[in-house]
């Protein structure tokens, strides 16, 4: 994360959504990797 971005109030107010989005994209990446791995 960009540390300077955290001074923006928006970052604080969206933190939960940002974390949710991060978790979701990590989950999607893991699933994608699993599909690739399974196809090998």
């Amino acid at each position: 994360d960009n540390p300077s971005l955290s001074i923006d109030l928006t970052f604080h107010l969206l933190r939960t959504l940002l974390e949710l989005a991060r978790t979701q994209s990590q989950r999607e990446r893991a699933e994608q990797n699993r599909i690739i791995f399974d196809s090998v």
Partner: antibody, heavy 118, light 112 residues
Framework: QVQLVQSGAEVKKPGASVKVSCKAS????????MKWVRQAPGQRLEWMGV????????FYNQKFKGRVTITRDTSASTAYMELSSLRSEDTAVYYC???????????WGQGTLVTVSS | DVVMTQSPLSLPVTLGQPASISCRSG???????????LEWYQQRPGQSPRLLIY???NRFSGVPDRFSGSGSGTDFTLKISRVEAEDLGVYYC?????????FGGGTKVEIK
């Protein structure tokens, strides 16, 4: 000083798309989220969405989801808002805005009038 | 969505006299961090909105001290102690505590 300069007025036909730009200066573009707000004649201000210019995370107001696309070009310190499937009710002034550590909309662009008319 | 209701819709004022605008939220806008993200904006004719007050009662830099904000929970007020000609325009309250962020319908301050 912080400046947000938006692109000029647009006239579009129903069903078309419009892309409005917002060039930021006077601060490090990637340090602050950029928001988009619109003001239709006689209507209240409406928050449309917000982008994290650093990592590209975008959050939309559900009301506009599917029709609005917010992007950014960090090398040009510019944010963009594209609205598709335009209808007459989309006739409005569109603003970009930036917050601070204390408030959400501390600095505003000059606004871009988008007129949707057949 | 949190509905922000302002009153009055129109506020005829006499220059030099006080003015007061009310803003009510449809639900509490106290954020989970215990702060209340209630802001007030002024929009002069033909101009972009301008931030006046943040977090209920804090004046933004450069805002004259004749402007003050108060309130809590669901009930908020913007006061102008002595209205000046440059204060004419539309005033909006805004809540940033809940997504989607929402604005009030506006109060037009005009000469009586």
């Amino acid at each position: 000083q912080v400046q947000l300069v938006q692109s000029g007025a647009e006239v579009k036909k129903p069903g078309a798309s419009v892309k409005v730009s917002c060039k930021a200066s006077g601060y490090t573009f990637t340090d602050y989220f950029m928001k988009w707000v619109r003001q239709a004649p006689g209507q209240r201000l409406e928050w449309m969405g917000v982008i994290n210019p650093n990592q590209g995370d975008i959050f939309y107001n559900q009301k506009f989801k599917g029709r609005v696309t917010i992007t950014r070009d960090t090398s040009a310190s510019t944010a963009y808002m594209e609205l598709s499937s335009l209808r007459s009710e989309d006739t409005a002034v569109y603003y970009c805005a930036r917050g601070t550590d204390r408030a959400l909309f501390a600095y505003w662009g000059q606004g871009t009038l988008v007129t949707v008319s057949s | 969505d949190v509905v922000m209701t302002q009153s009055p819709l129109s506020l005829p004022v006499t220059l030099g006299q006080p003015a007061s605008i009310s803003c009510r939220s449809g639900q509490s806008i106290v954020h989970s961090d215990a702060n209340t993200y209630l802001e007030w904006y002024q929009q002069r004719p033909g101009q972009s909105p301008r931030l006046l007050i943040y977090k209920v009662s804090n004046r933004f830099s450069g805002v004259p001290d004749r402007f003050s904000g108060s309130g809590s929970g669901t009930d908020f007020t913007l006061k102008i102690s002595r209205v000046e000609a440059e204060d004419l325009g539309v005033y909006y309250c805004f809540q940033g505590s809940h997504i989607p962020w929402t604005f009030g319908g506006g109060t037009k301050v005009e000469i009586k």
